[in-house]
């Protein structure tokens, strides 16, 4: 089957959600690990990740269609320490498949705002930190 990984971001007030979505077939979930890395150009692994999610096969989902699994990493307040390059990755212990998403970046600016770049064009986000709104 076709397995892929996408990255996205959303904001709720001061919170920034970084989301790694893996699309896969139901039977491929077992043994899959999804993880998010920061500033790891070559050695992104579950061990060096900020967060990881081990997928489980859900017997409640019928059919053999494609399903998605999400890892959500929530930052309550973006600070200058969050500036850097992020990447969503996944790997399967069973099949040996490794997936690497596009790199995306958080840039904290001198004005106290931050931007998230490198996502799909519609997901290029600019956030005003103090108001917590999309600008």
């Amino acid at each position: 089957g076709c397995i892929n990984i996408t990255s996205s971001a959303s904001q709720e007030g001061t919170r920034l959600n970084l989301i790694c979505t893996v699309w896969h077939k139901k039977e491929e979930a077992e043994g899959f690990v999804v993880f998010l890395c920061k500033d790891r150009s070559g050695d992104c692994s579950p061990e060096t990740s900020l967060k990881q999610l081990r997928l489980k096969r859900d017997p409640g989902i019928d059919g053999v269609g494609e399903i998605s699994s999400q890892l959500m990493f929530t930052i309550s307040q973006v600070t200058p320490l969050h500036s850097g390059t992020y990447q969503c990755c996944a790997r399967s212990q069973k099949s040996g498949i490794r997936l690497q998403g596009h790199f995306f970046s958080i840039l904290f600016t001198e004005t106290g705002n931050y931007t998230v770049t490198g996502l799909k064009q519609r997901q290029h986000l600019e956030f005003s930190h103090n108001e917590g709104t999309l600008s």
């Epitope: 920061k38 500033d39 990740s49």
Partner: antibody, heavy 119, light 107 residues
Framework: EVKLVESGGGLVQPGRSLKLSCAAS????????MAWVRQAPTKGLEWVAS????????YYRDSVKGRFTISRDNTKNTQYLQMDSLRSEDTATYYC????????????WGQGVMVTVSS | EIVLTQSPTTMTASPGEKVTITCRAS?????MHWYQQKPGASPKPWIY???KLASGVPDRFSGSGSGTSYSLTFNNMEAEDAATYYC??????????FGAGTKLELK
């Protein structure tokens, strides 16, 4: 078990230098931003400096800017605080702490090391 | 720089008593964290993001607040709760600031 062990404190004269170390274990050190927080005798807590996971970005409180340098060696799981031009008001217990990545709380703290600046 | 003012500075409470410590910020902040520190020990995270209990903290503790006013409450004082409590926030560009602390003693 997360462990942070500070060393390098002691008595030093005003204007002199001292270098503190913090040896970390029990977690993937290179993934975490780190900080130094100090506490003057019988006083409250005061953030001193922070460093990002890769060591390329550093941040300081105004009163130590230009005098203190925070650094880290991810191959040795250790962070440092180089303190130059020390003043009597720098006398404090210095704590090594980890930054929680999802929040702005300091989630693990070392036992602290005493620095006394006096002639 | 945002200044955090804790009150009271010192207080005494009897076992079983309800205790409330407040922290006022000089400007509005998004979250408040609280730490417990006992003599000769390093601070421990106690409550984070205003109302979430840190690992191992008894559920008699609670945190609340918004804007410039935050509080730490425990429903029935126990001997082990005697300590100094500090509030802390983050904002840009002053970064991390702490309150001066509230020393809680057992009556």
């Amino acid at each position: 078990e997360v462990k942070l062990v500070e060393s390098g404190g002691g008595l030093v004269q005003p204007g002199r230098s001292l270098k503190l170390s913090c040896a970390a274990s029990g977690f993937t050190f290179s993934t975490y931003a780190m900080a130094w927080v100090r506490q003057a005798p019988t006083k409250g807590l005061e953030w001193v400096a922070s460093i990002n996971s890769g060591g390329g970005d550093t941040y300081y409180r105004d009163s130590v800017k230009g005098r203190f340098t925070i650094s880290r060696d991810n191959t040795k799981n250790t962070q440092y605080l180089q303190m130059d031009s020390l003043r009597s008001e720098d006398t404090a217990t210095y704590y090594c702490a980890t930054h929680n990545y999802e929040s702005t709380v300091f989630d693990y703290w070392g036992q602290g090391v005493m620095v006394t600046v006096s002639s | 720089e945002i200044v955090l003012t804790q009150s009271p500075t010192t207080m005494t409470a009897s076992p079983g008593e309800k205790v409330t410590i407040t922290c006022r910020a000089s400007s509005s902040v998004s979250y408040m964290h609280w730490y417990q520190q006992k003599p000769g020990a390093s601070p421990k995270p106690w409550i984070y993001e205003t109302s979430k209990l840190a690992s191992g903290v008894p559920d008699r503790f609670s945190g609340s607040g918004s804007g410039t006013s935050y509080s730490l409450t425990f429903n029935n004082m126990e001997a082990e709760d005697a300590a100094t409590y500090y509030c802390q926030q983050w904002n840009y560009p002053s970064m991390y600031t702490f309150g001066a602390g509230t020393k809680l003693e057992l009556k």
